[in-house]
């Protein structure tokens, strides 16, 4: 069966300066390929985190994505700012040249509250 990307939260609210977790789990690790988090959709979407060797300031993975059986691709955003508001999508790709997007989560909207 086709892999599903599940984002259970429709929205989260976080105070500026605090941290928040955006949950994402997969039903399967197949087909082989990366998982990436984006804010927004379409051509203008912004890459927030990729479960690779790249470094993203203020964004970390919640569980160890290198473990072979791990299906949790949740991320933590620290020191949230008003500019972090928006809808975040967890996206599964199939490895290739280039990688192909095959499934996206339903999105989680982040609301940033004034401190």
């Amino acid at each position: 069966t086709e892999v599903k990307v599940i984002q259970p939260e429709k929205s989260v609210s976080v105070a500026a300066g605090d941290s928040t977790v955006l949950n994402c789990t997969l039903t399967s690790l197949l087909p082989v390929g990366p998982i990436r988090w984006y804010r927004g959709v379409g051509q203008s979407r912004q890459l927030i985190y990729s479960f690779t060797t790249e470094h993203f300031p203020r964004v970390t993975n919640v569980s160890d994505a290198t473990k072979r059986s791990n299906l949790d691709f949740s991320i933590r955003i620290s020191n949230v700012t008003p500019e972090d508001a928006g809808t975040y999508y967890c996206v599964k790709f199939q490895r290739g040249s280039p990688d192909t997007e095959i499934q996206s989560g339903g999105g989680t909207e982040v609301y940033v509250l004034a401190k």
């Epitope: 599903k4 599940i6 939260e9 429709k10 789990t25």
Partner: antibody
Framework: EVQLVESGGGVVQPGRSLRLSCAAS????????VNWVRQAPGKGLEWVSL????????YYADSVKGRFTISRDNSKNTLYLQMNSLRAEDTAVYYC????????????WGQGTLVTVSS | EIVLTQSPGTLSLSPGERATLSCRAS??????LAWYQQKPGQAPRLLIY???SRATGIPDRFSGSGSGTEFTLTISSLQSEDFAVYYC??????????FGGGTKVEIK
């Protein structure tokens, strides 16, 4: 106080159409996703359809896909369910249910309206 | 589609007794599970969400537990108004949202 009041139910022949309404009050209607959930006589709850606050995102149960249409008018604080090609198995009490703002469980329910499909 | 199986179908107990209702999911739903109470001729009412958090106004004799695929709703001491049908619902996966088949708690 949140209130959801369904209307439009009744007896209808198989193959005919019916439109249900749900009038909402006591909350900012346009900010919440709302659903239709039905319950056949003596049976359990069955989710039917969901529409997001803006009306942009819509889902249907396989059992009604292609026959039922969910819509909303945020200016009137009203949810609708257009039911076409009705079948005997669509006989049920239809509830409108307001989702929690963060998760897809149901904080508030209407009292329900009975739809009977019979010749 | 995630399937929820509730057991038993009917529970016959006396007022003051403890009721234990079970809900099993066909795959993990983590703690994204809610419980509802429905009395005859009435709409369902939210009791528990997040597997163990009581909804507003729900008495503390109602408690929920579990995670993954096994969940329990416990009513510590049944009151006359607790005799009803109880449903579980998962909201982990995006629609279709699914309910269990229900457990009827009746007076013995």
């Amino acid at each position: 106080e949140v209130q959801l009041v369904e209307s439009g139910g009744g007896v209808v022949q198989p193959g005919r159409s019916l439109r249900l309404s749900c009038a909402a009050s006591g909350f900012t209607f346009s900010s919440y996703d709302v659903n239709w959930v039905r319950q056949a006589p003596g049976k359990g709850l069955e989710w039917v359809s969901l529409i997001s606050g803006s009306g942009e995102i819509i889902y249907y149960a396989d059992s009604v896909k292609g026959r039922f249409t969910i819509s909303r008018d945020n200016s009137k604080n009203t949810l609708y369910l257009q039911m076409n090609s009705l079948r005997a198995e669509d006989t049920a009490v239809y509830y409108c249910a307001k989702e929690n703002n963060r998760y897809r469980f149901f904080d508030d329910w209407g009292q329900g309206t009975l739809v009977t499909v019979s010749s | 589609e995630i399937v929820l199986t509730q057991s038993p179908g009917t529970l016959s107990l006396s007022p003051g007794e403890r009721a234990t209702l079970s809900c099993r999911a066909s795959q993990s739903v983590y703690t994204y599970l809610a419980w509802y109470q429905q009395k005859p001729g009435q709409a369902p009412r939210l009791l528990i969400y997040g597997a163990s958090s009581r909804a507003t106004g729900i008495p503390d004799r109602f408690s929920g537990s579990g995670s993954g695929t096994e969940f329990t709703l416990t009513i510590s001491s049944l009151q006359s108004e607790d005799f009803a049908v109880y449903y579980c619902q998962q909201y982990y996966d995006r629609p279709p949202l699914t309910f269990g088949g229900g457990t009827k708690v009746e007076i013995k």
